[in-house]
């Protein structure tokens, strides 16, 4: 049995330009201790979309549901979507360290942007 699962339930999300996109992610546990971060794309060139403690992400709002008793919610909402936001977004769990170590990624959610 896996100690930690990172679940992105939607494979894809389609949003009209100018609207907001909600990207869902849950983890089965806070343990191991360490942050959840959101990225667009994979590999060394991936773009950091949201970090819970560091950086400034004015278009991104955490939208967790704390009533979910059986898991931890790390969902985000991105406002004012433009075609440039299209891509696959990954919710990634890190283990706290110096530096933090990437532990597990969700399967990804592909965001497509429709014309207004």
């Amino acid at each position: 049995e896996e100690e930690l699962q990172v679940i992105q339930p939607e494979k894809s999300v389609s949003v009209a330009a100018g609207e907001s996109a909600t990207l869902n992610c849950t983890a089965t546990s806070l343990i191991p201790v360490g942050p959840i971060q959101w990225f667009r794309g994979v590999g060394p060139g991936r773009e950091l979309i949201y970090h819970q403690k560091e950086g400034h992400f004015p278009r991104v709002t955490p939208v967790s549901d704390p009533t979910k008793r059986n898991n931890m919610d790390f969902s985000i909402r991105i406002s004012n979507i433009t075609p440039a936001d299209a891509g696959t977004y990954y919710c990634v769990k890190f283990r706290k360290g110096s530096p933090d170590v990437e532990l597990k990624s969700g399967a990804g959610t592909e965001l497509s942007v429709r014309a207004k």
Partner: antibody, heavy 118, light 112 residues
């Protein structure tokens, strides 16, 4: 019904060792993060140790790090706290507690008393 | 370490009235919009019992006269109306991703 039953407490001299056990039933033990929390009249409640559901990750506060070791046997639905180099300040009631998500302590055992005294 | 300061240390309230307990954290315990602050009730000779998880969520089986509120650093547990069986000591606890996890010093609730 969820049950957590601690055992292994007792009187021990400073510098001595004790092994506490916690027997779990009534829930899927292997899915839960498990912890020990202790309580003293002077210091109140203090988190002592936590172990991930599969046993890979363990965490301790500085007050017990290097002296206490937490382990689990999911096949036996059991949790163990090995306490070495015990000090007078380790005297407390020790509670075994479960954490489904590694967050709040869902269920607590009745506790076992550890007294460190010469 | 995140220090949790509970106030008052003790509280005497008349039956049927409101009891309010405060817990202040030395730094934010919020992550992704969830406040990792929890409340427990402990009666003499018994272990603590979870009442409220993640600031405001009532644990299953807990009477709805208990409620929790707050975010970031300031949290409140309210018992309204207070009943005789609520005489106990109440503790707040934070489980943010900053170890060590810590507890408040407790608030003893008695009947006036």
């Amino acid at each position: 019904e969820v049950q957590l039953v601690e055992s292994g407490g007792g009187l021990v001299k400073p510098g001595g060792s004790l092994r506490l056990s916690c027997a779990a039933s009534g829930f899927t033990f292997s899915s839960y993060v498990m912890s020990w929390v202790r309580q003293t009249p002077g210091k109140g409640l203090e988190w002592v140790a936590t172990i991930s559901s599969g046993g890979t990750y363990t965490y301790y506060p500085d007050s017990v790090k290097g002296r206490f070791t937490l382990s689990r046997d999911n096949a036996k639905n059991s949790l163990y706290l090995q306490m070495n180099s015990l000090r007078a300040e380790d005297t407390a009631v020790y509670y075994c507690a479960s954490q489904l998500t590694g967050s709040e302590f869902d269920y607590w055992g009745q506790g076992t008393t550890v007294t460190v005294s010469s | 370490d995140i220090v949790l300061t509970q106030s008052p240390a003790s509280l005497a309230v008349s039956l049927g009235e409101r009891a309010t307990i405060s817990c202040r954290a030395s730094e934010s315990v919020d992550l992704y919009g969830t406040s990792f602050m929890h409340w427990y009730q402990q009666k003499p000779g018994q272990p603590p019992k979870l009442l409220i998880y993640r600031a405001s969520n009532l644990e299953s089986g807990v009477p709805d006269r208990f409620s929790g509120s707050g975010s970031r650093t300031d949290f409140t547990l309210t018992i309204n109306p207070l009943q005789a069986e609520d005489v106990a000591t109440y503790y707040c606890h934070q489980s943010s991703d900053e170890l060590p996890w810590t507890f408040g010093g407790g608030t003893k609730v008695e009947i006036k």
